[in-house]
C-alpha cells in the first residue's frame, strides 16, 4: 500500500467517540500523552482530532482494478506535532511525536460503516484495528470471517466548531 | 477499465414489482461499496440506496423504505434493486454506481448507463 | 437531513467565460462533497472529489473549493463540451445531491 501523494488531500477537524458514545480524550501525563477512553460529564468539551486523509494504491497484487484500486488512509493528530501511531509488537495505540514524513505506523485504513461511523485498520498489520479494551485503546484483531460491525472497533466522528490547537 | 451495466428495467404497473441487477467488471468488487442513484425524466438525481463491501449495511431514501431491498452476491459481482409496491413516482433510470475507495462510502467514481423504469397503469 | 441548494438553476455565459456554480449545504459538511457533470442522455461523470481534487481524465480548466456548507465548482474558460448539468452530492452525513445547474452557451 503506497500512499499517492505527499499532501493529504483533505483534512477534517472532529471529535472521536466510541459505538457507545464514550468520548476519546487525550492527556499530557509526565510530557507524554495518554488516551483514554470516558464518558464525558455533560458540558465537559470533546477533545478534537485533526483527521487527515491520503490516498493510497492497493498493492499491483491484491487488486486487479488498476489505477481504481484505491484506499483511503487517515492519520489522527489530537495536538500539534503528535499522532496516533499503532505499536503492533504491543497490540497498543499510542501517543508520539513525529516528523514528517511520517512513518507507515501513524497511517490507518479508513472504513466506513456509514458515513460517520469508522473504522481504522492498522497500515503495517492489515486485519487489524484501533479498538476498546478496558477503557483504553488498543489494536484488535478482526478475523475476515467476522463482521467489521463489531462494535468495539466502531467509533463515530461528530464535527466540531472549533479550530484544532495545532 | 471499470464497467456497470444494469439490466432489469421496464414498464410495470403501480403495484407490481421489479428487480434489478448490475453486473460490474474491471475492480475488485467486493471491496467497494455500491449504490442505486435514480434520475426521474427531466429531472436532477436522487440517491436511493447504498450497500457497504461486504453486504451487511444498507441504507435507503425515506420514501422507499420497507419497499425496496438492495443486496449483493460478491461471487457474481452483482448488485441488485428489489422493487416492491411500485408508485408511479418511482418512474426513472436507475443508475448502479461504484464507490470511490475500498471500504467506504465517502465519494462515488463510476456509474453505469441506467436502465429505465416506467410504473404506469 | 442534510439538503443540498445548487444556484443558479441555469447559467448561459460565452467561450472563454470564467463560470463558477455555487452548492450551498444545509449543514457543514466537512468538505465531503463531488461535482458531477451529466450531459444530455449521458451517465453522471465524477469531475472533482473531496471539495477539490481533480478526478483522473477530467481537464484542469475544472476547479472545485469551499469548506463548511458553501462550496463552488468553477471552469475557468468555458469550452463548447462542458454543455451539461452539474451536480453536486454530499457525503458526510447520509447522501444527498443537489439538484443542479444546467450550463449554455450563448
Known amino acids: 500500500m503506497s500512499i499517492t501523494g505527499i499532501s493529504p488531500i483533505t483534512e477534517y477537524l472532529a471529535s472521536l467517540s466510541t459505538y457507545n458514545d464514550q468520548s476519546i480524550t487525550f492527556a499530557l501525563e509526565d510530557e507524554s500523552y495518554e488516551i483514554y477512553v470516558e464518558d464525558l460529564k455533560k458540558d465537559e468539551k470533546k477533545d478534537k482530532v485533526l483527521l487527515s486523509y491520503y490516498e493510497s494504491q492497493h498493492p499491483s497484487n491484491e487488486s486487479g482494478d488498476g489505477v481504481d484500486g484505491k484506499m483511503l488512509m487517515v492519520t489522527l493528530s489530537p495536538t500539534k506535532d503528535f499522532w496516533l501511531h499503532a505499536n503492533n509488537k504491543e497490540h497498543s495505540v499510542e501517543l508520539h511525536k513525529s516528523e514528517k514524513p511520517l512513518p507507515d505506523q501513524a497511517f490507518f485504513v479508513l472504513h466506513n460503516m456509514h458515513s460517520n461511523s469508522v473504522s481504522f485498520e492498522s497500515k503495517t498489520d492489515p486485519g487489524v484495528f484501533i479498538g476498546v479494551k478496558d477503557n483504553h485503546l488498543a489494536l484488535i484483531k478482526v478475523d475476515s470471517s467476522e463482521n467489521l460491525s463489531t462494535e468495539n472497533i466502531l467509533f463515530k466522528l461528530s464535527e466540531t466548531h472549533h479550530h484544532h490547537h495545532h | 477499465e471499470v464497467q456497470l451495466v444494469e439490466t432489469g428495467g421496464g414498464l410495470v404497473q403501480p403495484g407490481r414489482s421489479l428487480k434489478l441487477s448490475c453486473v460490474a467488471s474491471?475492480?475488485?468488487?467486493?471491496?467497494?461499496?455500491m449504490y442505486w442513484i435514480r434520475q426521474a425524466p427531466g429531472m436532477g438525481l436522487e440517491w436511493v440506496s447504498s450497500?457497504?463491501?461486504?453486504?451487511?449495511?444498507?441504507y435507503y431514501l425515506d420514501s422507499v423504505k420497507g419497499r425496496f431491498t438492495i443486496s449483493r452476491n460478491n461471487a457474481e459481482n452483482t448488485v441488485y434493486l428489489q422493487m416492491n409496491s411500485l408508485r408511479s413516482e418511482d418512474t426513472a433510470t436507475y443508475y448502479c454506481?461504484?464507490?470511490?475507495?475500498?471500504?467506504?462510502?465517502?465519494?462515488?467514481?463510476?456509474w453505469g448507463q441506467g436502465t429505465l423504469v416506467t410504473v404506469s397503469s | 437531513d442534510i439538503q443540498m441548494t445548487q444556484s443558479p438553476s441555469v447559467l448561459s455565459a460565452s467561450v472563454g467565460d470564467r463560470v463558477t456554480l455555487s452548492c450551498k449545504a444545509s449543514?457543514?459538511?466537512?468538505?465531503?462533497l463531488d461535482w458531477y457533470q451529466q450531459k444530455v442522455g449521458e451517465a453522471p461523470k465524477l469531475l472533482i472529489y473531496?471539495?477539490?481534487n481533480l478526478q483522473t481524465g477530467i481537464p484542469s480548466r475544472f476547479s472545485g473549493s469551499g469548506s463548511g456548507t458553501d462550496y463552488t465548482l468553477t471552469i475557468s474558460s468555458l469550452q463548447p463540451e462542458d454543455v451539461a448539468t452539474y451536480f453536486c452530492?454530499?457525503?458526510?452525513?447520509?447522501?444527498?445531491f443537489g439538484q443542479g445547474t444546467k450550463v449554455e452557451i450563448k
Open positions: 454506481a461504484k464507490g470511490h475507495y475500498s471500504y467506504s462510502s465517502y465519494s462515488i467514481d463510476y
Open positions: 474491471g475492480f475488485t468488487f467486493s471491496n467497494y461499496w
Open positions: 450497500i457497504n463491501n461486504d453486504g451487511g449495511n444498507t
Open positions: 449543514h457543514n459538511i466537512n468538505k465531503h
Open positions: 473531496f471539495t477539490n
Open positions: 452530492f454530499q457525503y458526510n452525513s447520509g447522501w444527498t
